[in-house]
C-alpha cells in the first residue's frame, strides 16, 4: 500500500518495527514538501535481509524519474549498500520510499527506522542555467528566492532579467553622443530603448557609429535577438547588429528615431554614435567700415550667428537706431536674416546745461562726436566750481560726456560768498547813526516778513537775515518764533514766512527776489528768557539766482572765542533809524518807523567782560552768555535797533579776503537803541558753524576752503 506524507518532517518505520517485519510485504511512502524545498532522508536503524544487488528485501529511494538509492542488508558490501550515516537528498520537492520484503526470511530482521525533513534549496548557488538564474542579484530565502537589479535598472516581468527604462530620450542640441545603456559595459537585457533626435527644421541629422560596435547576432538569421533600427520619417534603416558598425548615415531629416531592442540573454558591449546637424550655407560676409564681425569663419551655415560690432568711438547703426552690437543669423534657406549694418561715429549730443554755468566748445564747428571736448565754467564772480574742477569733458566711446574726476556727473557751481559786487567803504559815517547802503553793498541782506494769518487779526512782523547759499537764510531764532507764546519756543509756520533778497528800498520790491519758506529751523536750545542760542535757518522753497545784488555771506571758521575785541564790523537793516523816536512813541503814535532804504553802520566788537558788566549793572535779569558778543560805542549814537533783528554783523577776513558773518542782531536794552553804554548784543555765529552745516545738509569741507584760501 501507499502512504502520502505532506509534513515538513516525519518518521518512517518498517512494518512492525521494532519487531521483525513480515514477509512478502510492500509499502510506499510518497513525501511531498513545498516548492523551494528538498527532502533529506536518513536512517537511525537499518537491518534487512542481505542479497546480491538487494534482490530480496530492500528499501528503494526515488524521485519521479530517477532512483536515488537502494538499501539492504545490515552492512555495506561490494554488492549491497546500507545507508549507514549517509543522507539521501532529493533534487526536488518529492521523494518516494518503497520498502519490499520477499516471501521467505531465514532470520528475524528488525527492519528500519528513518527520518525525513524538508530542507531549503539555495537557488542562488545551485542555478547555473542562464535561462533560470538572476540577471544581477539573487536573494535566497527559506522556501524560495527572488532577483533584484542594480541601480538604474528595472526588474523585467519575468522576475529574472534586468532591463532599463530608456524609451524617453530626447536630443535637441545640434551635436551629441548617444550610447547603449551602461556603455561600454554590457547593455541590459529585455530592454526597448528609444532615442529621439529632434532639431529645428532646416537642419539635417548625420549619424556616425564610433568605437566599439557589439550587438548580439546570429550566424544565419539577421539580428533575431538584439538590434538597432533607425527610423527617418516613414523609412526604417536596419536592423543593425553584430560587430561591424554601419557606415555613416546622412538622414536628410531634422527628426530621427533610434530604436534599440535587447532580449533576455547575452552579454554584449553595445554601441556608441555621434550625431551632427548640417544646414544650408550662407554667403560670405564683409565687415562694415570701422567695424568687425565675430566669429570670423570661412563658411557660415544655417543657425550660425554673427555679432557685428564697431571700433571704439563708433556705434552700430541699423534702421536709424543706434546700438552697441547687432546680431544676424544664417537662415534655413541659406540667406542672412539682415543686411550688415553700418558703423557711425558716437555722438554725445548737446551737453547738459550747468546750473549757474556756461559751456564752451574746444573742438571746431562745436562738434559733439567721439573725442570732442567741451569746458564748463561757472558764472563768475557769483559762482565758483567745486573742488577747483577743470570743467573739461570729453565725448566718450559710450556717447556720454566724461570728466576725469567726476565721470559723467556735471560739476557743481557753488555760490561765492562774502564778495559784494560793490566794495564796502573803509570809513563809515557816524541803522541809528548809520547811512543809506548803495545797492549791492550787502548782497546777502534778506528782509524776512512773517505774517501769521492763522490769527484774526493777522500778526505781522519782520526781521533781517543773511543769505548763506542759494537756498538758505541765517537769522535769529526770536524772529521766527511764534509770538503768541509766553515761554514756549515754537517756530512760525513756514507758510507765514516770506523772504526778500536783493531788496534795497522797501517801497520798491519789484527788483527784489521774493521767496517762500520750505523749512523753518530754530536752534533746539533757544531760550526765550535770555535769548541764548538765538539762531535759526530758513530753507527757501526754490534756490535764488545769484547776481550783483544777491550773493551769500561766508560762514566763519569754528572759533569759540568769536570776533576779537575792537574789531570793526558792519551791520545793515531796515529797522528804526531815527534815534529821537522812542519805543513808546512808536507804539502810541503808529508813526511809520521802518527805514525805506537799507541802512548800515560800522561798529566795534566790545570786550566780553565790559559788556557783561554793563548789563549786570542794570536792574533786570540780563545775561550775556558765551554764545553772544556785544558791539557798539560807549558813547552811543550808533546801534542796531528794533526791526534789524537777525541781520548779519559782518567782519572782513584778511586771510580769505571775504566778508564773514560773525554775529546776528539779537537783543539790547532796556534803554533806547543807541543810548550811552547800551551795547547791541549779537549771537556768536562761530559757535554754531557745525550746527548750520548739519541743517543745510552740507559737509563743512565743501565750503570751508573758500574762506580759508
Amino acid at each position: 500500500h501507499t502512504v502520502e506524507l505532506n509534513n515538513m518532517f516525519g518518521q518512517i518505520q518498517s512494518p512492525g518495527y521494532p519487531d521483525s517485519y513480515p514477509s512478502d510485504s510492500e509499502v510506499t511512502w510518497n513525501i511531498t514538501v513545498p516548492d523551494g524545498f528538498r527532502i533529506k532522508l536518513y536512517f537511525m536503524h537499518f537491518n534487512l535481509e542481505s542479497s546480491y544487488l538487494c534482490e530480496y528485501d530492500y528499501v528503494k529511494v526515488e524521485t519521479e524519474d530517477q532512483v536515488l538509492a537502494t538499501f539492504c542488508g545490515r552492512e555495506t558490501t561490494d554488492t549491497e549498500q546500507t545507508p549507514g550515516q549517509e543522507v539521501v537528498l532529493s533534487p526536488g520537492s518529492f521523494m518516494s520510499i518503497t520498502f519490499r520484503s520477499d516471501f521467505s526470511n531465514e532470520e528475524r530482521f528488525t527492519g528500519f527506522d528513518a527520518h525525513y525533513m524538508a530542507v531549503d534549496v539555495d537557488e542562488c548557488k545551485e542555478r547555473e542555467d542562464e535561462e533560470l538564474s538572476c540577471d544581477h542579484y539573487c536573494h535566497n530565502y527559506i522556501g524560495g528566492y527572488y532577483c533584484s537589479c542594480r541601480f538604474g535598472y528595472i526588474l523585467h516581468t519575468d522576475n529574472r532579467t534586468c532591463r532599463v527604462e530608456c524609451s524617453d530620450n530626447l536630443f535637441t542640441q545640434r551635436t551629441g553622443v548617444i550610447t547603449s545603456p551602461d556603455f561600454p559595459n554590457p547593455y541590459p537585457k529585455s530592454s526597448e530603448c528609444l532615442y529621439t533626435i529632434e532639431l529645428e527644421e532646416g537642419f539635417m541629422v548625420n549619424l556616425q557609429f564610433e568605437d566599439i560596435f557589439d550587438i548580439e547576432d546570429h550566424p544565419e538569421v539577421p539580428c533575431p535577438y538584439d538590434y538597432i533600427k533607425i527610423k527617418v520619417g516613414p523609412k526604417v534603416l536596419g536592423p543593425f547588429c553584430g560587430e561591424k558598425a554601419p557606415e555613416p548615415i546622412s538622414t536628410q531629416s531634422h527628426s530621427v528615431l533610434i530604436l534599440f531592442h535587447s532580449d533576455n540573454s547575452g552579454e554584449n558591449r553595445g554601441w556608441r554614435l555621434s550625431y551632427r546637424a548640417a544646414g544650408n550655407e550662407c554667403p560670405e560676409l564683409q565687415p562694415p567700415v570701422h567695424g568687425k564681425i565675430e566669429p570670423s569663419q570661412a563658411k557660415y551655415f544655417f543657425k550660425d550667428q554673427v555679432l557685428v560690432s564697431c571700433d571704439t568711438g563708433y556705434k552700430v547703426l541699423k534702421d536709424n537706431v543706434e546700438m552697441d552690437t547687432f546680431q544676424i543669423e544664417c537662415l534655413k534657406d541659406g540667406t542672412w536674416s539682415n543686411k550688415i549694418p553700418t558703423c557711425k561715429i558716437v555722438d554725445c549730443r548737446a551737453p547738459g546745461e550747468l546750473e549757474h554755468g556756461l559751456i564752451t566748445f574746444s573742438t571746431r564747428n562745436n562738434l559733439t562726436t567721439y573725442k570732442s571736448e567741451i569746458k564748463y565754467s561757472c558764472q563768475e564772480p557769483y559762482y565758483k566750481m567745486l573742488n577747483n574742477n577743470t570743467g573739461i569733458y570729453t565725448c566718450s566711446a559710450q556717447g556720454v560726456w566724461m570728466n576725469k574726476v567726476l565721470g559723467r556727473s556735471l560739476p557743481t557751481c557753488l555760490p561765492e560768498c562774502g564778495q559784494p559786487s560793490r566794495s564796502l567803504p573803509s570809513l563809515v559815517k557816524r541803522i541809528i547813526g548809520g547811512r543809506n547802503a548803495e545797492p549791492g553793498l550787502f548782497p546777502w541782506q534778506a528782509l524776512i516778513v512773517v505774517e501769521d494769518t492763522s490769527r484774526v487779526p493777522n500778526d505781522k512782523w519782520f526781521g533781517s537775515g543773511a543769505l548763506l547759499s542759494a537756498s538758505w537764510i541765517l537769522t535769529a531764532a526770536h524772529v521766527l518764533r511764534s509770538q503768541r507764546r509766553d515761554t514756549t519756543v515754537i517756530p512760525v509756520s513756514k507758510e507765514h514766512v516770506t523772504v526778500y533778497l536783493g531788496l534795497h528800498d522797501v517801497r520798491d520790491k519789484s527788483g527784489a527776489v521774493n521767496s517762500s519758506a520750505a523749512r523753518v529751523v530754530l536752534h533746539p536750545d533757544f531760550n526765550i528768557q535770555n535769548y541764548n542760542h538765538d539762531i535759526a535757518l530758513v530753507q527757501l522753497q526754490e534756490p535764488v539766482p545769484l547776481g550783483p545784488h544777491v550773493m551769500p555771506v561766508c560762514l566763519p571758521r569754528l572759533e569759540p572765542e568769536g570776533p576779537a575785541p575792537h574789531m570793526l564790523g558792519l551791520v545793515a537793516g531796515w529797522g528804526i533809524s531815527n534815534p529821537n523816536v522812542t519805543v513808546d512813541e512808536i507804539i502810541s503814535s503808529g508813526t511809520r518807523t521802518l527805514s525805506d532804504v537799507l541802512q548800515y553802520v560800522k561798529l566795534p566788537v566790545v570786550p566780553h567782560a565790559e559788556c557783561k558788566t554793563s548789563y549786570e549793572s542794570r536792574s533786570g535779569n540780563y545775561s550775556v552768555t558765551e554764545n553772544m558778543f556785544c558791539a557798539g560805542y560807549y558813547e552811543g549814537g550808533k546801534d542796531t535797533c528794533l526791526g534789524d533783528s537777525g541781520g548779519a554783523f559782518v567782519i572782513f577776513d584778511d586771510l580769505s579776503q571775504r566778508w564773514v558773518v560773525q554775529g546776528l542782531v539779537s537783543w539790547g536794552g532796556p534803554e533806547e537803541c543807541g543810548s550811552k553804554q547800551v551795547y547791541g548784543v549779537y549771537t556768536k555765529v562761530s559757535n554754531y558753524v557745525d550746527w548750520v552745516w548739519e541743517q543745510m545738509g552740507l559737509p563743512q569741507s565743501v565750503v570751508e576752503p573758500q574762506v580759508e584760501r
Epitope: S454, R455, V456, P457, V479, Q483, R484, I587, L642
Partner: antibody, heavy 113, light 112 residues
Amino acid sequence: EVQLQQSGAELVKPGASVKISCKASGYTFTGKWIEWVKQRPGHGLEWIGEILPGSGSTDYNERFKDKATFTADTSSNTAYMQLTSLTPDDSATYYCVRSEDLWGSGTTLTVSS
Amino acid sequence: DIVLTQSPSSLAVSAGEKVTMTCKSSQNLFNSRTRKNYLAWFQQKPGQSPKLLIYWASTRESGVPDRFTGSGSGTDFTLTISSVQAEDLAVYYCKQSYIPFTFGGGTKLEIK
C-alpha cells in the same frame, strides 16, 4: 457769510462723555485757529484751548488737559470738543471762537443724574 | 499763567455819561517784535455770545461804534465809552493773547 454753528444743548449723566461740534462756513477753515471757551452761569469766561484744523496742532489750558480733547474734520469744516468723565461742575455753556473775532452761539451742557 | 484783573466789577451810569473800566495784567503784554499789545476787549449782552470790540489794546473792530476806545500798554489797559447808550448794557471782558489765553473777571455795566 462767515459763521460758526454749534450743536444743540446736551443733558448727560455724571461720568459720561459728550462731543460738541462747531461747523464753520464762509472762510478757509483749515487756516484759522478755533478756540473753545467755557462760561458757567454767573461766572466769567474760561479759555479751554485751541486747535488749528489744517495741521491738527493744539494748545490746552493746563486745567482742561485731562478733560477736553479737540479734533477737526477738514472735509466737513467741523471742529469738535470731547469732554470726558463729566461732573456737575462741567455744566456750562461752551463757545467755539474763530481766533477771537467770531463767536459761535454756544452749546449748553447740563450734567445731572 | 497771566492773570488779568478788571475793575470795577460793576458800575451803573446814566445814558450819555462817559465810562472808564480798567484791566491790569500780571505780565507785560507788549510784544517788541510785532510792536503790539496782545489785549482784546469783548462785550457780552444778556443771553448773547461775546462780541469783539477792541484788539491789540487800541484797534477798534470794524462795525464797532467810535464811542468805544481802548488804550494802554504793557500791563495797564483801559476801555472807555465816551457816551453810554442804553444798548451798551452788558458785561465787558478783557482777554490777553499769550498762550494760555486768559480772561479778566468782567465789568458789569448797568444803565440807571
